[in-house]
Interface confidence: medium
Amino acid sequence: EEELQIIQPDKSVSVAAGESAILHCTITSLFPVGPIQWFRGAGPARVLIYNQRQGPFPRVTTVSETTKRENMDFSISISNITPADAGTYYCIKFRKGSPDTEFKSGAGTELSVRAKPS
């Protein structure tokens, strides 16, 4: 059984205000069973951006069909970016349980927001 890796290939992404940002994340194994969640920031102050199992998250859509059992692409698109969205985004795998427990994190992608072109 292959060891799970969380691949966030972009160190940083720069998006103009009002546009959409695509944050890439793929996983290399379906095990352990459990959801993927996206957070902005790390530590206790981190903000949940997307949870595969709950919602809705009105500005967030998944790039691929995450409900398919064999899906390994958990990239997300965040619409209508504002300066408040700037920060480092982490794609995190949780192990199924009561409650689910954090298993492994991607390296993070820093989102910077440029002024809207005039």
């Epitope: 691949i7 290939p9 160190k11 940083s12 290399t28 390296a107």
Partner: antibody, heavy 119, light 108 residues
Framework: DVQLVESGGGVVRPGESLRLSCAAS????????MNWVRQAPGEGLEWVSL????????YYADSVKGRFTISRDNSKNTLYLQMNSLRAEDTAVYYC????????????WGLGTLVTVSS | ETVLTQSPGTLTLSPGERATLTCRAS??????LAWYQEKPGQAPRLLIY???SRATGIPDRFSGSGSGTVFTLTISSLQSEDFAVYYC??????????FGGGTKVEIK
């Protein structure tokens, strides 16, 4: 202009150790992830190791894991590769390579230093 | 680990001819692919990143294309200084960062 200058290569016997250095200039060294890449005689390029700008994140190729140690001294703008338990198959030119600040490709490379492991 | 396979191993052409080099990935790397040029005694040089973006100072006779698993480096009209070894590198699936085996472009 970015400059990367490797040193420390030489001829050693199997099982011996060697420490490579890479002196960097022309950029803010601590802001960039750095890598070692090697090329055995007549072979292609092989990634060896990566260290983040802060030194907190480190990765190794399976072929060197447990034998090689990457480190950096940001106050001296220098990258290191400590190579222990050297084997004949470690014979190669070792390049120091600076990563792009957004992606993991290599913007700049040194000229390399040759390591020969032979009995 | 993503394996990159370059073809052909050697390309024998004359100055002024067009060179087409191919790099195939064992799984999708989207457009996270770079090309490098290597000459004896010189540091490898970044040519292309993001599959198709030319690095600073690279002449426009060099172009890259492709996405997913198949990528191409094209040199539209070979100059004497272009005879070298070319490597592709993926930076989607990492670590390890992986390189192709190289294509040698030599003078006919």
């Amino acid at each position: 202009d970015v400059q990367l200058v490797e040193s420390g290569g030489g001829v050693v016997r199997p099982g011996e150790s060697l420490r490579l250095s890479c002196a960097a200039s022309g950029f803010t060294f601590s802001s960039y992830d750095m890598n070692w890449v090697r090329q055995a005689p007549g072979e292609g390029l092989e990634w060896v190791s990566l260290i983040s700008g802060s030194g907190e994140i480190i990765y190794y190729a399976d072929s060197v894991k447990g034998r090689f140690t990457i480190s950096r001294d940001n106050s001296k703008n220098t990258l290191y590769l400590q190579m222990n338990s050297l084997r004949a198959e470690d014979t190669a030119v070792y390049y120091c390579a600076k990563e792009n600040n957004r992606y993991r490709f290599f913007d700049d490379w040194g000229l390399g230093t040759l390591v020969t492991v032979s009995s | 680990e993503t394996v990159l396979t370059q073809s052909p191993g050697t390309l024998t052409l004359s100055p002024g001819e067009r060179a087409t080099l191919t790099c195939r990935a064992s799984q999708s790397v989207y457009t996270y692919l770079a090309w490098y040029q290597e000459k004896p005694g010189q540091a490898p040089r970044l040519l292309i990143y993001g599959a198709s973006s030319r690095a600073t100072g690279i002449p426009d006779r060099f172009s890259g294309s492709g996405s997913g698993t198949v990528f191409t480096l094209t040199i539209s009209s070979l100059q004497s200084e272009d005879f070298a070894v070319y490597y592709c590198q993926q930076y989607y699936d990492r670590p390890p960062l992986t390189f192709g085996g190289g294509t040698k472009v030599e003078i006919k």
